[in-house]
């Protein structure tokens, strides 16, 4: 019969022959022959392979280096890599999360639109009219100006995006 030019899924072509790939968590030791199956070997501790493969070496698990602000989010297995994330107050600098940077704070006049996570930075927004923020914070949203009317007071000093209004007593007309 004609030697194959293509192989089924989870197989690979070698020496005009279709050999089985090694399953995730195992690496290739020797290709199949006419008389023998593909020989595979489990990855050792701290190693993984996450696909059907013909790799001769397993990959080493990623190390989540605390010196770079990293911590383990999920421990690796023989079939999965370790997933790193950042310590509280930090976020990853890239999708691969190889290092972390401190969450940005929103300056006075700006509030937090979205709190940072282990993988995304703080998103700030300018405080619109009627709202203010007088602190630099990675958590505080813009606060609404105090409503003097509900306290039976009047505005003595207008608010800004960085300061609240100042309320005071209403001037009473004397008889």
């Amino acid at each position: 019969p004609e030697p194959p030019t293509a192989c089924r899924e989870k197989q690979y072509l070698i020496n005009s022959q279709c050999c089985s790939l090694c399953q995730p968590g195992q690496k290739l030791v020797s290709d199949c022959t006419e008389f023998t199956e593909t020989e595979c070997l489990p990855c050792g501790e701290s190693e993984f392979l996450d696909t059907w493969n013909r790799e001769t070496h397993c990959h080493q698990h990623k190390y989540c280096d605390p010196n770079l602000g990293l911590r383990v989010q999920q421990k690796g297995t023989s079939e999965t890599d370790t997933i790193c994330t950042c310590e509280e107050g930090w976020h990853c600098t890239s999708e691969a999360c190889e290092s972390c940077v401190l969450h940005r704070s929103c300056s006075p006049g700006f509030g937090v639109k979205q709190i940072a996570t282990g993988v995304s930075d703080t998103i700030c927004e300018p405080c619109p009219v009627g709202f203010f923020s007088n602190v630099s914070s990675a958590f505080e949203k813009c606060h609404p100006w105090t409503s003097c009317e509900t306290k039976d007071l009047v505005v003595q000093q207008a608010g800004t995006n960085k300061t609240d209004v100042v309320c005071g007593p209403q001037d009473r007309l004397r008889a």
């Epitope: 690496k27 030791v29 070997l41 489990p42 990855c43 050792g44 501790e45 701290s46 190693e47 397993c58 080493q60 698990h61 190390y63 989540c64 280096d65 605390p66 911590r71 383990v72 421990k75």
Partner: antibody, heavy 118, light 106 residues
Amino acid sequence: EVQLVQSGAEVKKPGATVKISCTVSGFNIKDYYIHWVKQAPGKGLEWIGRIDPEDGDTKYDPKFQGKATMTADTSTDTAYMELSSLRSEDTAVYYCTTSYYVGTYGYWGQGTTVTVSS
Amino acid sequence: QIVLTQSPTIMSASPGEKVIITCSATSSVSYILWFQQKPGTSPKLWIYSTSNLASGVPARFSGSGSGASYSLTISRMEAEDAATYYCQQRTFYPYTFGGGTKLEIK
């Protein structure tokens, strides 16, 4: 800085039980396996077993099954190994160590000497 | 269980001499770790994943091998290399150590 600090030396009578500890700093104990290794006086290294502190899963060398019991407390980042029914041949230095890729050092504790003597 | 046999058990080498320590397994393993131990101290990881030098290990050391046959090589022996070296496999439970090779300086 990563450190594994073990409890102090112990002298025990035959038949007694000893529990030694290994407290880690510089990483969360639940993130990596902790291995225990025995070294009898003038002898080589023997692997006793390992624990996954996250879920308590353990693997032992059959030789130490029933002799050693490994546990871990993630709240204090401490691993423990208890040795029961002590005999003179249990006299050794016992080490705790991490999965090898922790910072490519594979950190080891300083060792705990257990002496069994009547 | 996998038995690791180290050879030689004991050897001495002159400064500048090339040293090869072997570690053979009773069946194939994924990788070998090498540890160095000096008297009265804890072992230190020396080579991981068969051929990668651990942090702080001098470049005169190298590791190689695959399957059931591995080796640690020192290109030029130095006095500070005198120690006992152990290989370990972490592929199949129970994990096992070789019996050790005591390397002395002449």
